[in-house]
Interface confidence: low
Amino acid sequence: IVLRPSRVHNSEENTMRALTLKDILNGTFSYKTFFPNWISGQEYLHQSADNNIVLYNIETGQSYTILSNRTMKSVNASNYGLSPDRQFVYLESDYSKLWRYSYTATYYIYDLSNGEFVRGNELPRPIQYLCWSPVGSKLAYVYQNNIYLKQRPGDPPFQITFNGRENKIFNGIPDWVYEEEMLATKYALWWSPNGKFLAYAEFNDTDIPVIAYSYYGDEQYPRTINIPYPKAGAKNPVVRIFIIDTTYPAYVGPQEVPVPAMIASSDYYFSWLTWVTDERVCLQWLKRVQNVSVLSICDFREDWQTWDCPKTQEHIEESRTGWAGGFFVSTPVFSYDAISYYKIFSDKDGYKHIHYIKDTVENAIQITSGKWEAINIFRVTQDSLFYSSNEFEEYPGRRNIYRISIGSYPPSKKCVTCHLRKERCQYYTASFSDYAKYYALVCYGPGIPISTLHDGRTDQEIKILEENKELENALKNIQLPKEEIKKLEVDEITLWYKMILPPQFDRSKKYPLLIQVYGGPCSQSVRSVFAVNWISYLASKEGMVIALVDGRGTAFQGDKLLYAVYRKLGVYEVEDQITAVRKFIEMGFIDEKRIAIWGWSYGGYVSSLALASGTGLFKCGIAVAPVSSWEYYASVYTERFMGLPTKDDNLEHYKNSTVMARAEYFRNVDYLLIHGTADDNVHFQNSAQIAKALVNAQVDFQAMWYSDQNHGLSGLSTNHLYTHMTHFLKQCFSLSD
């Protein structure tokens, strides 16, 4: 149980106030984290509060400004990147968001040795992606879907690709579906460790169907946005991987990396690329039916200037109970012999654990084990492996950092974070310097977040990087809700839940209940993290109890729970929310006539289905940007969990799992449907179809659209959205305004 600091004395109580909606919308109680921008084993960069770029040397304790705020301001720079030889900095301005990760920008190169901007051979604008080589100051960038290379910032560019074309051929950057559902990056190019080679992906979207929607803007006629977007079962992008020698790029040109035969025999995806050495690269491929993944290690053949991927260096990962991997197939972390690697995948008991692969996957040595999951491998050095897991005290919603000494036999395991600030910090991530000489720990809660710097050898805390003192002081006179994390055992299923309780919670009283749900495959909502957000306000000021439940399909509790939803999305996720609500009612403090559910995206889908479950449990609910039919969503995501919408595969469940099919069941609930018209991700089409089905069934409902807003409903729309949802819930729960 995590109890937020409570105030005991009545005199103190009087000076304290509840959270307001304005607090939330203004971000009054937002926290800061500190992630060092490591540039060596003992040095990092950080942008100071006054916008100077400062280099810190941990060992000397010295810091100095490498780039002044004056220089930053001269080009309205919002971001920077130092070249590895420390001679140049790129300054990024005119940021223009595209999709989740992608954006375009204008780039200026500042010459630190001369103290001026590089002039001549300047970069074109806007650039889709730009990065330094890992050594020296070479630049690779993508402009108009083609890749260019500069040996030095002031040199003329060398054009690597020539076939790039908007919405057709993408070089070095992903198309929409690869960005959102496979790579989770804005880039699709990778420098080799010493900058000798540059690998890149080419995506051919020529045959992909296009989603088109109106962008209303301010003009007389709306613009039409066209995005090649493969929905479930549609034609997918065709991907090819090339590698070019950046020292002599014109010599042999880009060389294609062969696709493993067992992958190439049918539709497939490229999932990630990992450089091992300058002349060894590891590619991961995935069948379109995403239960077979192949990791292929390829070597540079100097004599032919080609890349060879021997079958003996192909490692197959297959799932017989679900899809391959968790949300994504994990990526390997190679050891210093440059052939063996560490990787997270399911063990024989169905828990994701770290394995060491030396020759074949079959002969993998399991490094971690237990009824918990290893979540991320941060760093492998010659003597240590750092990873995160949720092992400690058997709370799946925690994250602690562990070190395994791989240099000694038998390897010994140490929890680096478990006992550091036990009450305050139970959910960590980490950022390591080169050779793990130093690392930063970022604690996200459940207490106020804190970032600290540590010695990579001794794990000793060196200093606090950010402790959010201002936030701590600001919260001193705020009545925060209490939070508890517990579990329900139902029919051999463990349902972890987080309950957010009003500050003066009294078990003998009855409270309205709001379920906040996401519930997507491999997600986790019940986490030991700090947050002062909309639901905090609803508990603090409006006296609601809010609950989040991780049901079947959610992550980090083993494959049985995770893969339970395989090929049948929209069934167990909903059942488990309903089961939890019934258990909450049994606890005795829930007013069963005032229960609501809300969710966004996948959560909007689950909340809609829960409202239409016919249980009579829910008085009202909200769906923000919901999926309404899996036929409308992206192929890569949807087919991972649902297979194909074909008669001989899983069309029947595609049809059965729509929100529209349950339109009739919305008759006895109050339903608020919300969507942005420019949602590139979950298309407005989804809500349009729900609305149409409800109208056709003559079911009353409420709706709100946000013109020209995407899946995030940002800016002023956010304020409007939460104000609108608050009114809706207060009305539903008969709470006075």
């Epitope: 060596s40 050594v135 020296g136 100051s137 040996q151 030095r152 010659q382 080169d434 050779y435």
Partner: antibody, heavy 120, light 108 residues
Amino acid sequence: DVQLVESGGGVVRPGESLRLSCAASGFTFSSYAMSWVRQTPGEGLEWVSFISSGGAYTHYTDSVKGRFTISRDNSKNTLYLQMNSLRAEDTAVYYCAKEKEIWNAFFDYWGLGTLVTVSS
Amino acid sequence: EIVLTQSPATLNLSPGDRATLTCRASQTVGSKLAWYQQTSGQAPRLLIYDASSRATGIPDRFSGSGSGTEFTLTISSLEPEDFAVYVCQQYYDWPPLTFGGGTKVEIK
């Protein structure tokens, strides 16, 4: 003041072994990578071996791979070069050198050198 | 490996003269090039790193320039103590770290 003092040189026969040491002072030894560089009489400089600050990473020039081993003891502020199966062409003055900054393997401080003579 | 070729092998000059020494790399080394001075029987002394950055305590008559494969060390006005061997070293692509063969600056 930074000081690097090599020792352990001498005259040996081909096939024999020798262990060079380099005692460091005047700087935080454990924070810097170190290298051995040799110079054949009347010839140029040749890099021999590199070791990272913590000793986890070592590199060698091809001609000494498998024969020489670089190591360090940070508690003693000392760098070592174990030379086995010595050959006549290994005859040189051996310098230990301190890297100026991590990632940049050039040397701001050098020892005075120790002479290794391999002769039958 | 990257081969560094220095020219000329010997440079005969008088005190006060300007000395221009060249170091050519067999392939690009970016700006990862250092220059050392070595007087007979002594250890090398770092003059320039990153092609053009003067090391601590080095007089400003020494300057380095160049990038990629062509580098120059310039001594604007030779002092008596400057007559020595000058060696370039690349640290761009290593191992191995490689040195040039050296240029000997002799008194004419």
